[in-house]
């Protein structure tokens, strides 16, 4: 088996250390194997074989140390973790995420109170009464909390017409309030007395376009924690009833309004004041906001747009979209079911990602069953524990600065894993302050370049042209991005992550993210594209490699070599086919050949009852349904006619 | 430990009315919905009405509307159920109970209407 | 109202073995159902609530179930202290209504 610390010709202990885990480095001023080199980078056995003796061998082992003492969590164990990593090698712990039995709720109804609502908010004067005894089986202590919105105050989402201005749902013969963002209307109490009459008192309101300000809302109602009253130890639940999609970021423009959202809270006097200054948030920072405040989204939709809220689910963990019936009958139920699957759920997500670390979890559901640590365990109940299996990998070491901790956050908890990371880089015998030894091996060295004195290495520059740092002659030396040291480029260290390559034109930083994760954190980023691990592909690394055979025909063939395989879905490039594998395509040569006798069955004038009779025999199979509306092009396309 | 304290046995003539009490000790009266419970000798049980203690919010079975009045006093942490215009049917032990997950009942007051 | 109908009213069965109790409603009720342990002394205890979570202190021999409009208690191995009389009861909409009851013996 190829030793990979042998052969790679390390020239440092740090190089040698970077290697693999396997490899350790003998600092032994003495230690020499004979021959033409010395081969002071190996396996730990190899080196003691050889002579060299075990407290000379630098060898940084994994550790994984979790303090017992000063465990504060309840429900996610252990809160705090300190591995130390060396390249290539990985460590492992188990965290058990244990949901209470009953936990505190906060339900906060945020209500568009566009015309459309008007009937279903007649609704909600009666949901507190009896929701708090339906959720009574749930929580022993239940708040309710409310909040209205519109849209944006500023033209063309609402009418400024000056008779409009104030009355937007004239058309509805309904007295409104004037439009708004967002305004905070009762904070979390347990009064259900309060929120009855604070619900009574609500008045509809009324905007022009479809989509409603919405996003915008939830973002303030997540951030504004005091305003809201959202308590540390409760659940966090986010009522969204609507009938209307949402607008996202970028819609604004059209309004002049090109202030990127901020994600901080802006409400004064209970009311969101930078409605008419700043973006609706992106679905990646309302994702992030409602993630970093623990909150739960309960999307209440009545009418066909429920689907549009379905779609979103997958990009905002921890939340759930349900139907309401005609005014809102059945919107507690709703709210009963949506608490139960929140609460019998656990996933995990990895926050505040390390550079250069790599986080692999699985868990280890309660029935046994072992699933991705982001989809998690579900029908978990108060009893039960659910454990995840955490690997940690660092593949390099060529990390510089940075963030030396990860979170690992189960969705919709108030608790976390903190995840110290120290990374093993550095070999002792580099450290002036430890006993000195060899950390270059200087049979390696160029001698016309490197000059060198004890461990310490400069170089003689001048004799080496710049012309063979660049790529080209016209390009600048090292791409830019570096220096040239004896006519090899010595990469720039950028905060952004690594630069490299011969020219230092590649770099690990600029591959396409996937969930706030650089290649989905299941790949490699290198000049620009990522290079997934065995088990993952896709541009960013995202799909597992077993679903490309969702792609694959009954003839063997992806996509029918129609299409390209996205996650083990046909994505058609040729934009005449369509179906599961791209494998219908009407209008394509040779559908239009083999089926010449059956398309003029498709457009029956003029035909003899011969034909008529044998286009009901011969072309009965013949899925028409994909050639009625595409059949003008075999017709007119001259190849067809002759 | 949660308790609910109800009086004792009430014999009362037709025509009057009658106060049960329910006592709670152990826990936040105030935040759990307090139900009463009818059940007439060899019968089953009829829901008769509840209220929040916190919020005075009630809600009552339509066929008691009339006979019976449910209310709170928090200072005391006592609820009643007062019971008008007595007849031979109302001749039953009535219950208290915290209503939720953690659900406790009171050990029944049995009101016996006799002339 | 949502009426609350019990099968059977009463049953006789052996120690150690799986009695079943049946709850219909007129109506769909979402699964809030209780079920609830009237013992021969009078004194009431909340068995099972929302279907079918056990409430705390509830041997695990206690099992509920069902959706729509019915539902059924499962005592999985009878026991001398399981003799009572057993009532469901919907708590989906005003006013809440109990079944008839199901008094279980022990044979």
């Known amino acids: 088996e190829d030793n990979r610390c042998a052969s790679s010709n390390a020239a440092s202990c740090a190089r040698c250390l970077a290697l693999g885990p396997e490899c350790g480095w003998c600092v032994q001023e003495d230690f020499i194997s004979g021959g033409s080199r010395s081969e002071r980078c190996d396996i730990v056995s190899n080196l003691i074989s050889k002579g060299c003796s075990v407290d000379s061998i630098e060898y940084p082992s994994v550790h994984v140390i979790i303090p017992t003492e000063n465990e504060i969590n309840t429900q996610v164990t252990p809160g705090e973790v300190s591995i130390q990593l060396r390249p290539g090698a990985e460590a492992n712990f188990m965290l058990k995420v244990h949901p209470l039995k009953k936990y505190p709720v906060d339900l906060y109804y945020l209500v568009d109170v566009s015309a459309s609502m008007h009937n279903n908010i007649e609704k909600l004067n009666s949901v507190g009464n009896d929701l708090s005894r339906k959720m009574a089986f749930f929580s022993r202590d239940f708040r309710l909390g409310f909040g209205s919105y519109v849209d944006k105050t500023v033209s063309p989402y609402i009418s400024i017409h000056p008779e409009r201005i104030h009355n937007q749902c004239s058309d509805y013969n309904l007295d409104c309030m004037p439009p708004h963002g967002y305004i905070h209307v009762l904070s979390l109490t347990e009064n259900i007395t309060e929120f009855e009459k604070a619900v009574h008192r609500q008045k509809i309101s009324g905007n022009i376009d479809t989509p409603e300000g919405g996003f915008d809302a939830m973002l303030q109602a997540a951030v504004c924690e005091s305003h809201i009253g959202w308590r540390k130890e409760a659940k966090r639940l986010l009522l969204v009833m609507t009938d209307q999609t949402s607008h996202l970021a970028l819609d604004s423009k059209l309004a002049g309004i090109v202030v990127p959202n901020d994600g901080n809270c802006h409400l004064k006097n209970n009311v969101y004041v930078k409605s008419t200054t700043m973006e609706h948030p992106s679905l990646g920072q309302l994702s992030e906001k409602l993630i970093d405040n623990n909150i739960n989204v309960i999307f209440a939709v009545q009418g066909k747009q429920f689907h549009w809220y379905k779609d979103l689910l997958p990009l905002l963990p921890g939340t759930i979209a349900g139907e309401i019936e005609s005014k809102a009958a059945n919107l507690n139920n709703l709210v009963v079911e949506a608490y139960q699957k929140l609460i019998s759920e656990v996933k995990v997500q990895v926050e505040n990602q390390v550079q250069g670390i790599y986080f692999n979890i699985t868990a280890i559901c309660p029935d046994g069953s072992r699933k991705p640590g982001m989809e998690g365990c579900r029908n978990v109940t108060s009893n039960d524990e659910v454990l995840f299996n955490v690997t940690v990998t660092m593949k390099k070491c060529d990390v510089t600065g940075g963030k030396n901790y990860a979170i690992i956050k189960p969705i919709g908890f108030n608790e976390t894993a903190k995840i110290h990371i120290h990374r093993n880089c550095s070999c002792q015998c580099e450290d002036n302050r430890g006993p000195k030894g060899k950390c270059v091996d200087e049979t390696f060295l160029d001698s016309k370049c490197f000059q060198c004195d004890e461990n310490k290495c400069h170089f003689d520059e001048d004799q080496f042209s710049s012309e063979s740092c660049k790529s080209h002659k016209d390009q600048p030396v090292c791409s830019g991005r570096g220096v040239c040291v004896c006519g090899k480029c010595s990469c720039h260290k950028i905060k952004l992550g690594k630069v490299y390559g011969k020219y230092c034109e590649k770099d690990d930083f600029s591959c396409p993210y996937h969930h706030g994760n650089l290649c989905a954190g299941h790949g490699e980023c290198e000049a620009g594209r990522c290079q997934c691990f065995s088990g993952w592909e896709g541009d960013r690394c995202q799909c597992p490699s077993a679903a490309a055979q969702h792609c694959v025909n009954s003839k063997g063939q992806v996509c029918s070599g129609r299409g390209t395989c996205v996650c083990g879905r046909c994505e058609c490039t040729d934009p005449r086919s369509i179906g599961r594998f791209c494998e219908h395509c009407p209008t394509c040569y040779t559908a239009c050949k083999e089926n010449w006798n059956c398309m003029q069955c498709l457009h029956p004038h003029n035909l003899s009852q011969a034909i008529l009779d044998q286009c009901k025999t011969s072309c009965a199979l013949m899925e028409q349904q994909h050639y009625v509306d595409q059949t003008s092009e075999c017709f007119s396309s001259p190849s067809y006619l002759r | 430990e949660v308790q609910l304290q109800q009086t004792g046995a009430e014999l009362m003539k037709p025509g009057a009315s009658v106060k049960i009490s329910c006592k709670a000790t152990?826990?936040?009266?105030?935040?759990?919905?307090i139900e009463w419970i009818k059940q007439r000798p060899g019968h089953g049980l009829e829901w008769i009405g509840h209220?929040?203690?916190?919020?005075?919010?009630?809600n009552y079975n339509e066929k008691f509307k009339g006979k019976a009045v449910i209310t709170a006093d928090t200072s005391s942490n006592t609820s009643y159920m007062q019971l008008s215009s007595l007849t031979s049917e109302d001749s039953a032990v009535y219950y208290c109970?915290?209503?939720?997950?953690?659900?406790?009942w009171g050990q029944g007051t049995l009101v016996t209407v006799s002339s | 109202d949502i009426e609350m109908t019990q099968s059977p009213s009463s049953l006789s069965a052996s120690l150690g073995d799986r009695v079943t109790i049946s709850c219909s409603a007129s109506?769909?009720?979402?699964?809030?159902l209780n079920w609830y342990q009237q013992k021969p002394d009078g004194t009431v205890k909340l068995l099972i609530y929302y279907t079918s979570s056990l409430h705390s202190g509830v041997p695990s021999r206690f099992s509920g179930s069902g959706s729509g409009t019915d539902y059924s208690l499962t005592i999985s191995n009878l026991e001398p202290e399981d003799i009572a009389t057993y009532y469901c009861q919907q708590y989906s909409d005003l006013p809440y209504t109990f079944g008839g009851g199901t008094k279980l013996e022990i044979k």
């Open positions: 152990g826990y936040t009266f105030s935040t759990y919905w």
């Open positions: 109970a915290r209503w939720g997950w953690d659900s406790y």
């Open positions: 109506q769909g009720i979402s699964n809030y």
């Open positions: 209220i929040l203690p916190g919020s005075v919010i009630t």
